[in-house]
C-alpha cells in the first residue's frame, strides 16, 4: 500500500540509527510512465542502493561520525535513460548512538590563579571531545571535580562549569585562598557523556595543577573633588598598591593636558597638587602604572576617575557691552524685539547657572516708563505699551539685571526705533552660473559671493539682508554669511560635500530682512537667485551602515557560531576588508570579506555583558582608507554556575551539651540571572553518613534550615556537607560545607581557654 514505505517520487527525509545492520527497505518509489527505472546519485558511499524498480535500501551499518547526513538524489528515467522526473533530494539523517567516549585533550593541565580573584571567573579551561552528536545526550559532556587536594575543612575552593569545563574559584576560594598558607593545589577532573545523567555514560579523567598567586592591584573607586579648594595642597585623594613591594609608580595623563594637577608617590598614594577649576575641566581620567626596576609595566594600568564638583564661583556675563535691537515704528504690542542671552560658566542645569532677568531702568522714560518688558527666565524683550515714534524718541536704553543664586550683573540694551520696512531686497543677478568643486573642499571655504540691495533705511533691520538657501541643499552643506556693511553674501561650506549623494545641486537663494515687511508688501522673484554646484569625486573612507552594531546570543553558544555581522560600503564601490580591534578577551573573529562575526572561544556572561569590540572596515586597494564602528555582543544567561552559600557561615555554634535539638538557617545563591521569580533551590545532605545526626529542610527558594536529630554531640567542630541543586536546565549542583562547633558556653558565647583564640565562632544557636 502507498504510505510509509512506498509512494511517488518526491523530496523525502529518513532517519536511521547508526551501527544497526540493515533490517528493512527504506522506501519503494513508484514510477509514472514514461518513467520505467530509477537512478540514485549523491553521497551513497556504496551503502545506499536503488533497484531499477525503485526499491531504496542500504546494505551495511551506518556511522554518524563518518557522515551524519547523506544527501542523495533519486531520478526517474524513461526507457532511453533520460531523466523524466527529478532528481529529487532524499536526505538520510544518521541518528547518533553513544559509541564514542569523551577524551580530554591533555592528560595534565597547569594553571595559576591570583588570590582574591572574582568567584566564577574562569582562569583555566579543561577541554574534552566526544565524537558523538553534541545535540544529543551522547555528545553532551558533563565536567566534575572528583577531588581537590589539599581539601581544607572539607571546603571546595575551586568549581568547574559542568558544561564548558571552565575552572574558577568558589566564593570560599576567593576569600580563603592564601599562597602563604598553600601555594599549590591539585584537582582531578572527570568528564562524562550523556550529560552526566546515565549509568551507561562513558568517562575520562585528567589532572590539573594550580599555583595560587597574590593580587591587590585594583582600580580605586572614582573620586569627587570640589573645585577651588582652599585646603593646603597636595591633598591625598586615593591610592593604588602593587602586589609586591619595590614597584615604581607613575601616572599617565591620557589626555596630554598642558597642566596635569595630580601626582603619585612611591607608596602608591595619589594626590591632587593644586586647586581644580571645574570651568576649565570638569573631569579627569588618567592611569596609574606600576613598573619594575627596568621600567617595564608589571600589569595593565589602572584607570583613575576624578570628577570636579561645581561651586557657584562665576557671575552671569553679558553677551556684549551693549546689545543692540531694532523695532519698527509700526510694531504691535507684544511683538518680540529680541532675546538677551547672558551666560554663566558654572555647571549647566544647576542652580549655580540658572539665570533671572529684570529691567531695572529705561531711558528716556518717554512718552512713559515701562514701554518694554523682559521674560524673567527666557530673556526675551517685548513691546509692552504702545507703538513707538522715531521722530519723538529714536533710541531707548535699558539696564537689565541678570542674576544667579549668588551674583548679579547689569547688562545694557540699546533699542533703535527704525523706519517701516516697505522695500524688498533685490539681487543684482538672478543666476550665478555653475561652480565645480572637489568633494573634499575644506569646511569654511568661501565658494561664491552674492549681492542684493535694499532701499530701506541704511544700517537698520529693514535694509539689512539675510541670505537663506531655500532649495537644493536639504543636507545643509552650505551656509551664507552677510557682511553687515555692504550686505554682500559669502557662500561657505558648512558640512563636507559628497559626490556620491549630491553630484549636482541646483541652489536657490532668498534675500530677506530681519525686520518684517509692512502689510501689503511681499517678497517677489527679485529676492531670489540661483546657482549650480557641481561636485567632483575624491576617494573616501568606507562608511558603516550603523555607528553601533548589536547582537544577542546565549553565553553557551558553540565555538564557531555566527554571533552577528557588520556591513560597510565604500563610497567609491571598492571591496572592503573587515577586522576586529579591542577583542581583549579573544572571544571573536570576523570574516574579512563578509563582515560575519563568529565566536572562537567560550563566552561568559558573568565576565561582563555586553562585550564591546571595535570593527574596522578598510578599503581593498585604493588608498586603504578605513573607518571604525562598535560591535556590542549581549550575552544571555545560561545555567552554568552551581549554587553556593550566600555568605560566610564560619562561626556557627551550639552550646555543649545540647539541652534540646537545635537548628540554624542558611541562605544559598548563584551567579546566574534569576529573572522574575528568583532562584528555586532544593537542599539535601551531602552524604548518607550525615543522615543520623542532621536533617535539612527547605524554607523557600533560597533558604533552608539545618537541624540536629539528637543531643548527643561531642565538644568539637562538625563539617556538614549540603547539596544544593538549582533546578535549572541543565540542573547544576553545588556541595557546600557548613562548619558547626559544639562548645562550652559562658553567657551564651563560646568559651575557649587562653591561647585557643583562633577562629572563635561568633554566632550562637
Amino acid at each position: 500500500q502507498e504510505g510509509k514505505f512506498s509512494g511517488p517520487l518526491k523530496p523525502m527525509t529518513f532517519s536511521i540509527y547508526e551501527g544497526q545492520e540493515p533490517s528493512q527497505i527504506i522506501f519503494q518509489f513508484k514510477a509514472n510512465p514514461p518513467a520505467v527505472t530509477f537512478e540514485l546519485t549523491g553521497e551513497t558511499d556504496n551503502i545506499f542502493v536503488i533497484e531499477r524498480e525503485g526499491l531504496l535500501y542500504y546494505n551495511r551499518a551506518l556511522d554518524r561520525e563518518t557522515r551524519s547526513t547523506h544527501n542523495l538524489q533519486v531520478a526517474a528515467l524513461d526507457a532511453n535513460g533520460i531523466i523524466v522526473e527529478g532528481p529529487v533530494p532524499i536526505t538520510i539523517k544518521v541518528k547518533d548512538i553513544n559509541d564514542n567516549r569523551p577524551t580530554f585533550l591533555q592528560s595534565k593541565y597547569e594553571g595559576s590563579v591570583r588570590q582574591n580573584s572574582r568567584p566564577g571567573k574562569p582562569f583555566l579551561y579543561v577541554n574534552a571531545t566526544d565524537l558523538d552528536d553534541p545535540a544529543t545526550p551522547n555528545g553532551q559532556l558533563y565536567y566534575q571535580i572528583v577531588i581537590q587536594l589539599p581539601m581544607i575543612n572539607n571546603v571546595m575552593y575551586f568549581q568547574i562549569n559542568n558544561k564548558t569545563g571552565a575552572i574558577s574559584l568558589t566564593r570560599e576560594g576567593s576569600q580563603e585562598l592564601n599562597p602563604a598558607k598553600n601555594p599549590s593545589y591539585n584537582l582531578v577532573i572527570s568528564v562524562k557523556d550523556m550529560g552526566g545523567q546515565s549509568e551507561n555514560s562513558f568517562s575520562d579523567t585528567t589532572s590539573v595543577d594550580i599555583i595560587v598567586t597574590e593580587n591587590i592591584w585594583k582600580a580605586p573607586k572614582p573620586v569627587e573633588m570640589v573645585e577651588n579648594s582652599t585646603d593646603p595642597h597636595p591633598i591625598k585623594i586615593t591610592q593604588v598598591r602593587w602586589n609586591d613591594p619595590g614597584a615604581q609608580y607613575s601616572l599617565v595623563d591620557k589626555e596630554k593636558l598642558p597642566r596635569f594637577p595630580f601626582s603619585i608617590d612611591q607608596e602608591g598614594d595619589i594626590y591632587v597638587t593644586q586647586p581644580l577649576d571645574r570651568e576649565e575641566k570638569d573631569a579627569y581620567v588618567f592611569y596609574a602604572v606600576a613598573k619594575d626596576e627596568y621600567g617595564k609595566p608589571l600589569s595593565y594600568p589602572l584607570e583613575i576617575h576624578v570628577k570636579v564638583k561645581d561651586i557657584n564661583d562665576n557671575p552671569p556675563t553679558c553677551p556684549s557691552p551693549v546689545t543692540v535691537f531694532e523695532v519698527q515704528e509700526n510694531e504691535r504690542l507684544g511683538n518680540s524685539i529680541g532675546t538677551l542671552t547672558a551666560h554663566d560658566r558654572d555647571e549647566e542645569n544647576t542652580a549655580n547657572s540658572f539665570l533671572n532677568y529684570r529691567i531695572v531702568e529705561q531711558t528716556p522714560k518717554l512718552p512713559m516708563d515701562g514701554l518694554f518688558l523682559i521674560q524673567t527666565y527666557a530673556g526675551m524683550l517685548q513691546l509692552a505699551k504702545q507703538s513707538l515714534k522715531k521722530q519723538d524718541t529714536p533710541q531707548y536704553n535699558l539696564t537689565i539685571e541678570v542674576s544667579d543664586k549668588d551674583f548679579k550683573t547689569l547688562c545694557f540694551v540699546q533699542i533703535n526705533v527704525i523706519d517701516i520696512n516697505d522695500q524688498i531686497p533685490i539681487f543684482e543677478k538672478s543666476d550665478y552660473g555653475n561652480l565645480t568643486l572637489a568633494e573634499d573642499t575644506n569646511i569654511g571655504s568661501t565658494i561664491l559671493t552674492i549681492q542684493a540691495t535694499d532701499a530701506d533705511e541704511p544700517f537698520t533691520g529693514s535694509s539689512k539682508i539675510l541670505y537663506h538657501i531655500i532649495k537644493g541643499d536639504s543636507e545643509g552643506r552650505l551656509g551664507v554669511d552677510t557682511d553687515p556693511h555692504t550686505n554682500t553674501g559669502y557662500v561657505i561650506i558648512k558640512k563636507p560635500l559628497d559626490f556620491e549623494t549630491a553630484a549636482v545641486s541646483n541652489i536657490v537663494f532668498k534675500a530677506e530682512n530681519p525686520e518684517p515687511l509692512v502689510f501689503g508688501v511681499k517678497y517677489n522673484a527679485s529676492s531670489f537667485a540661483k546657482f549650480t554646484l557641481i561636485v567632483t569625486d575624491v576617494n573616501e573612507a568606507p562608511q558603516f551602515s550603523q555607528h553601533v552594531f548589536q547582537a544577542k546570543v546565549s553565553e553557551d553558544v558553540a565555538i564557531g557560531t555566527k554571533v552577528g555581522n557588520v556591513t560597510a560600503k565604500d563610497p567609491e564601490g571598492l571591496d572592503i576588508s573587515y577586522s576586529l580591534r579591542g577583542d581583549t578577551r579573544g572571544w571573536l573573529k570576523i570574516d574579512h570579506v563578509t563582515g560575519e562575526i563568529f565566536s572562537v572561544a567560550p563566552l561568559d556572561r558573568e565576565a561582563g555583558s555586553p562585550y564591546r569590540v571595535q570593527v574596522v572596515a578598510t578599503e581593498v586597494g585604493g588608498s586603504s582608507l578605513s573607518s571604525v564602528s562598535e560591535f556590542h555582543l549581549i550575552l544571555m544567561d545560561v545555567n552554568d554556575n552551581p549554587p553556593r552559600l550566600a555568605k560566610d557561615y564560619t562561626g556557627l555554634f551550639f552550646c555543649h551539651p545540647l539541652s534540646a535539638p537545635g537548628s540554624l538557617i542558611f541562605e544559598a545563591t548563584d551567579d546566574d540571572q534569576h529573572l522574575f521569580r528568583g532562584p528555586h533551590f532544593t537542599f539535601s545532605l551531602g552524604s548518607g553518613s550525615l543522615q543520623n545526626d542532621w536533617e535539612v529542610s527547605k524554607i523557600n527558594g533560597t533558604h533552608a534550615r539545618l537541624s540536629t536529630r539528637h543531643t548527643e554531640f561531642e565538644e568539637r567542630e562538625y563539617v556538614v556537607l549540603i547539596r544544593i541543586n538549582d533546578g535549572g536546565r541543565p540542573p547544576l549542583e553545588g556541595i557546600v560545607s557548613l562548619p558547626v562547633t559544639f562548645c562550652s558556653c559562658v553567657e551564651g558565647s563560646c568559651f575557649r581557654p587562653a591561647g585557643h583564640q583562633t577562629g572563635i565562632p561568633t554566632v550562637g544557636m
Partner: antibody
Amino acid sequence: QVQLVQSGAEVKKPGSSVKVSCKVSGYTFTDHTIHWMKQRPGQGLEWIGYIYPRDVITQYNEKFKGKVTLTADKSTSTAYMELSSLRSEDTAVYLCARWGYFYGSRSYYFDYWGQGTTVTVSS
Amino acid sequence: DIVMTQSQKFMSTTVGDRVNITCKASQNVGTAVAWYQQKPGQSPKLLIYSASNRYTGVPDRFTGSGSGTDFTLTITNMQSKDLADYFCQQYSSYPWTFGGGTKLEIK
C-alpha cells in the same frame, strides 16, 4: 551480431495505410527502445517516436501523433510502424534504430540502424 | 521544440584538410548531442556521443567538442572515404531533433 532488418519498399495510394516492420536479432529485444525516423530526399532526419517493448511504452513526436502508430511483437522480436491516411508528403525513407541505453549504462546514442524502407504515396 | 541548425549545407574540402562542422542548438542542451555519418544509400553511423565521446571503432581523426548551444565535429586529415553527410542530434528533451546535415564534397 546485432541486426535490424526492415520490410521492403511500398507504393501506396493517398488515403490508404502502410505498416513497416523492423525485425531485430542479436540482442534481447525487450532491453532497448526502438526509434523511428523519417528521411526525405535531400533533407535531414525527423524523429517520429519510440517504443519500449518491455513495458509497451510509446512516445511520439507531437507532429506525428494521429499519423503514426508504433507496436511491437515480443514473440517475433519485431517492431512495427503504421502510417495512416497517407498523403504525398508521407513519401520518404523510414528508418528504425536501436537506442543503445540499457539500465545502468551510459550509452546515449543510436548504435544500430535498419537499412530503411521507402514508402511512396502516389495516385 | 529545440532546433538544431547546421548552417553549412555543403562544405568543399581536400584530402588531408582539417574540417570543422558546426551545429547550434536553439536552447541549452548540455552535452546531450550525438553526431552521425551517412553515406548515399546507407543508414547513418554513430561517430560521437555525449558531445565529445568517440564511439568504439571510430577513427581518432573524428573529434567532438562543445556544450550548451554550440557544438563542433572536427575531422583532421580528411580522407576521401569521409565524403558523406554529417548530422548532429540532441537528446536533451523530447521531441529529439536532428540538424539539417552538412555534406562534404571534394573541391
